[in-house]
């Protein structure tokens, strides 16, 4: 082992305090015991330690824990977050929420980097579930984490966390990922009355299935155009000219401007032209008069 | 015991100058950062200048950069302040502060009179 | 015109709890740890609160202090007429490269 350079006379330091900024990285090593640091992380922060002498600090915590720190230190790591690789991270038992809040603050404003990736999936996995508080927490730092997640980590999801997402949450979400979140919406919100519900749910309705919808036309609900066009053709599809009419309310007009975009487009070719004439919007390409249309799904399950 | 001792206050003129000094004793002068901050009769506190232990950078208040001059020598674990072109608005008491971030301790003052 | 802004008098009767306030902005609080002095008539300023929110020994925990974002406060519980001073609060300020103070608060126990 190298021979460490010896603290000089009258530098040991007794607690962390400001003077330590004005130490050399080596006089830091040499006069800085890692116990003391470990008792005192909360003042780390407080101090404008330059990048190289904070990663004289976290080398002396690395050795002092080399199995990962304990909590009672990473809850005081502030910027020395920032020096850490997935790699510790993974080392961690993180199990309070004050601390996740902690060290996201710390991240704040950044795009999530590996390290917070790394700590909130180590946090998640700790507690079993994605809990209203840690969701609540982690949307608020980042709008879009939840559509990060896989499907298969959305079903981990209890239905009372889904009180915590607010729109701009799912704006990045995919279809498969709305089809996970609608039907814990769906149930969270079931309580509501018709248009409290529907102010709710219009954000999960991506992954809502035909039947629903229907439903909903039946509810004087209004749907914009934008949340429309979110939602899966394979159930926009099955839904009659009178049914949409009632589903976009006023709003009905704007399938004009949205003729050529899924699921409009799709959805106009499967509707009879006359149908689609009662509106008055001018859509065009429906199936023409007199025409038989055969539902071959239909077909090819009785076959 | 920590202790902060300021000298050289007094009378002079606008225009005219004073040096400062404040003889620190308690601690181990050399590791800490030292400062000047100033209270104005009846007025809060200003802060004047702040020096590293190694003297390497110099830190000054708007309001004296240019007249004021913060030394120290480590060997004689003293602080300065050179006070050149001195006006009627740096009539104050002049206090010597451990730390540049956060003054832990501080002297008793030595009050300062710009006066014709 | 201080840097950071502090109401100019805050009040209390013996026992009760006062709340001072410090406003700077993201060069100087934001960043930067918050010190708290207190100046009790015709002697010298003493530190009560560094780092935010650490007391020096022999500081009473009556005292307290805490920083969100770019603002600090100053608790006094259990007011005593000993408490009746000025307190300033103060920190680094990037920006101007120089530390600054509030004006001041003066507490008055009635």
């Known amino acids: 082992e190298v021979e460490k350079t010896a603290c000089p006379s009258g530098k040991k330091a007794r607690e962390i305090d400001e003077s330590l900024i004005f130490y050399k990285k080596w006089e830091l090593e040499a006069c800085v015991d890692a116990a003391l640091l470990a008792t005192q992380m909360d003042r780390v922060n407080a101090i404008p330690f330059t990048y190289e002498q904070l990663d004289v600090l976290k080398h002396k915590l690395d050795e002092l824990y080399p199995q990962g720190y304990p909590e009672s230190v990473i809850q005081h790591l502030g910027y020395l977050f920032l020096k850490m690789s997935p790699e510790d991270i993974r080392k961690w038992n993180v199990t309070s929420l004050e601390t996740l809040k902690a060290l996201l603050e710390v991240n704040k404003g950044h795009e999530m980097s590996p390290q917070v990736a790394t700590l909130i999936d180590r946090f998640v996995k700790g507690r079993g579930q994605l809990d209203k508080d840690t969701l609540d927490t982690l949307t608020a730092f980042y709008p879009g984490y939840l559509c990060s997640l896989s499907p298969e980590e959305l079903s981990s999801v209890p239905p009372s966390s889904i009180w915590a997402v607010r729109p701009q949450d799912l704006d990045t979400c995919d279809p498969r990922q709305l089809d996970v979140l609608y039907p814990k919406a769906r149930l969270a919100f079931q309580n509501m009355n018709g248009s409290e519900y529907f102010v709710k749910i219009q954000s999960f309705l991506g992954g809502a299935p035909t039947e629903d919808l229907k439903a909903l036309s039946q509810q004087n609900v209004s749907m914009d155009l934008a949340t429309f066009m979110k939602l899966r053709t394979d159930a926009v599809l099955p839904l009659t000219v009178a049914e949409v009419q009632k589903l976009l309310g006023p709003h009905v007009e704007g399938l004009k401007a949205e003729e050529r975009h899924r699921p409009v487009r799709d959805w106009i070719l499967r509707q009879r032209q006359d149908d689609l004439d009662t509106l008055g919007l001018g859509l065009q390409g429906g199936i023409p008069n007199g025409y038989l249309v055969l539902d071959l799904s239909m077909q090819e399950a009785l076959s | 015991e920590v202790q902060l001792l300021e000298s050289g206050g007094g009378l002079v003129q606008p225009g005219g100058s004073l040096r400062l000094s404040c003889a620190a004793s308690?601690?181990?002068?050399?590791?800490?950062?030292m400062s000047w901050v100033r209270q104005a009769p009846g007025k809060g506190l200003e802060w004047v200048s702040g020096?590293?232990?190694?003297?390497?950078?110099?830190y000054y208040a708007d309001s004296v950069r240019g007249r004021f001059t913060v030394s120290r020598d480590n060997s004689k674990n003293t602080l300065y302040l050179q006070m050149n072109s001195l006006r009627a608005e740096d009539t104050a008491v002049y206090y010597c502060?451990?730390?540049?971030?956060?003054?832990?301790?501080w002297g008793q003052g030595t009050l300062v009179t710009v006066s014709s | 015109q201080s840097v950071l802004t502090q109401p100019p008098s805050a009040s209390g009767t013996p026992g009760q709890r006062v709340t001072i306030s410090c406003t700077g902005s993201?060069?100087?609080?934001?960043?930067?740890?918050v010190s708290w002095y207190q100046q009790l008539p015709g002697t010298a300023p003493k530190l009560l609160i560094y780092?935010?929110?650490k007391r020096p020994s022999g500081v009473p925990d009556r005292f307290s202090g805490s920083k969100s974002g770019t603002s600090a406060s100053l608790a006094i519980s259990g007011l005593r007429s000993e408490d009746e001073a000025d307190y300033y609060c103060?920190?680094?300020?990037?920006?101007?490269?120089?530390?600054?103070f509030g004006g001041g608060t003066k507490v008055t126990v009635l």
């Open positions: 502060a451990k730390n540049m971030l956060s003054f832990d301790y």
């Open positions: 308690g601690f181990t002068f050399s590791n800490y950062a």
């Open positions: 020096i590293p232990p190694d003297s390497g950078s110099k």
């Open positions: 993201s060069s100087n609080i934001g960043p930067n740890a």
């Open positions: 780092y935010n929110s």
């Open positions: 103060g920190s680094w300020d990037s920006d101007l490269r120089g530390y600054v």
